[in-house]
Amino acid sequence: GDMLIQKTIKKEVVLEEGTIAFKNWVKTGTEIYRQFWIFDVQNPQEVMMNSSNIQVKQRGPYTYRVRFLAKENITQDPKDNTVSFLQPNGAIFEPSLSVGTEADNFTVLNLAVAAASHIYPNPFVQVVLNSLINKSKSSMFQVRTLRELLWGYTDPFLSLVPYPVSTRVGMFYPYNNTADGVYKVFNGKDSISKVAIIDTYKGKRNLSYWESYCDMINGTDAASFPPFVEKSQVLQFFSSDICRSIYAVFESDVNLKGIPVYRFVLPSKAFASPVQNPDNHCFCTEKIISKNCTSYGVLDISKCKEGKPVYISLPHFLYASPDVSETIDGLNPNEEEHRTYLDIEPITGFTLQFAKRLQVNLLVKPSNKIQVLKRLKRNYIVPILWLNETGTIGDEKAKMFRSQVTGKIN
């Protein structure tokens, strides 16, 4: 009866050669797609000259198949019951699931100009940078193809910098032929309640980006959780995309292809300001942009991005404070479309369906030494793109799951 099922589950969710979990863990059987919507700026000149609100129009989806590569350098460590691995990155464009091609053009913030003015606050340096920005005919905004914006281009301004800096720029540059990790996770052999929980990331138990407990690497990578998930649980997971650990809470029961699953969502509380949720105090790293830590819904991850002023939010600034989006026109936050959820089969702890949604923004500030930023009268957190990464268990896999797991229990 129940004891036999528990025993079977405990055996099959262990991350070692020969188990169901291991086979699917090494290389996911689920097709995962990442859809991008790019925020095309409609009034670049007005913004640069008059510090007007930025009018954006989202264009998308542009879809890529991702996470199709098997984990690499898988190494079991019997001493501490862990398994380490690298998660290789790869993206293949899917024209049939996209509104256009990778050659489509977009007017977006000039990433290098915005970043350089932030990274080099020294006024003497800014004078030099200004001359190079002007010499390269760069401006506050630029026109780039989708491929360039996402995967990288040689920036004309950075090409004139006399220092050995990387001249390649892109929202996800470098991506193809790179890997995330090394992750070291518990394999569950000694304690099934720890299976898939991250022990270390890049050799450390903390990130060195945040103060206090915010810096901890908590939970799993969200692809699975320890088995026998309860609705009352708060599921912790780490996302390298947002450079932090976060959590999800139970929202509803869902039937997914005949499999009963629990839908866990990222609550708005996770994005709240320290005023509303004191637990978030250590995610507030500066006082000016955050209006003394009263702003909410955006996360400054510059420390994780070599000082580049990157801010992560939910799409269309969902759950963000009004001051964040007051400089941007054309946004329509919508909970159903823009929140993140995980559909978890509670017996195995496997995530059978998910939608990870996030928006990447860049801060641009006025600078009286940089001509193209001189006329700005306020700071802007500029949305560049938002993404929807989804995966759903395939019909064949679902059938197998029904017969081997949920069928046996019912």
């Epitope: 990274i119 080099y120 606050p121 020294n122 030099v128 940078l129 006399p162």
Partner: antibody, heavy 119, light 112 residues
Framework: DVQLQESGPELVKPGASVKISCKAS????????MHWVKQSHGKSLEWIGY????????GYNQKFKSKATLTVDNSSSTAYMELRSLTSEDSAVYYC????????????WGQGTTLTVSS | DVVMTQTPLSLPVSLGDQASISCRSS???????????LHWYLQKPGQSPKLLIY???NRFSGVPDRFSGSGSGTDFTLKISRVEAEDLGVYYC?????????FGGGTKLEIK
Amino acid sequence: DVQLQESGPELVKPGASVKISCKASGYTFTDYNMHWVKQSHGKSLEWIGYIYPYNGGTGYNQKFKSKATLTVDNSSSTAYMELRSLTSEDSAVYYCARDGGYDVYFDYWGQGTTLTVSS
Amino acid sequence: DVVMTQTPLSLPVSLGDQASISCRSSQSLVHSNGNTYLHWYLQKPGQSPKLLIYKVSNRFSGVPDRFSGSGSGTDFTLKISRVEAEDLGVYYCFQGSHVPWTFGGGTKLEIK
């Protein structure tokens, strides 16, 4: 006024590592690149590399890439250079030097740290 | 790497004389951004180097106007119009236009 105070002389054995420090004062440490320069006895100068304290970004002379590691501690306005797998060829005076502000010149220099590698 | 060749190796002068040091690079020092990052340093005995001239001809603050720099492309010159006792030491040219940045071998200015 701007000052760069380097750590004292070092006598180390071949194969060992050493970490030289350079404490900056009189300016905003995170605003300027810090460079390191080697001067072997009676010889010319060689640029090793630089670090930008604001974000820890580095640039190296390829010749020294596997020899030197540059780091900073912004809380104490101190730059460090670690030299590893030392040989007698590494015996030299090592200078830290502040960047003049993105025009690739060094406007202030430390007094130098003498490193002697000998068994 | 760009090789910086300084001549002469040693320059004996009398106080009050004019001195001229040449520096030649193995390739043009005009950076793709149009600037020429050729600088001159003086290292007095037992001291750290000090910046004299940056970007070919700009005197660094506090440097007397008897020091002047000129040149372009691959040929550069440092001139001292009237040598004083405090000018003695080793002069180095330096290029920051191509990584790795390199120094010349030095020219020792000494009393005749």
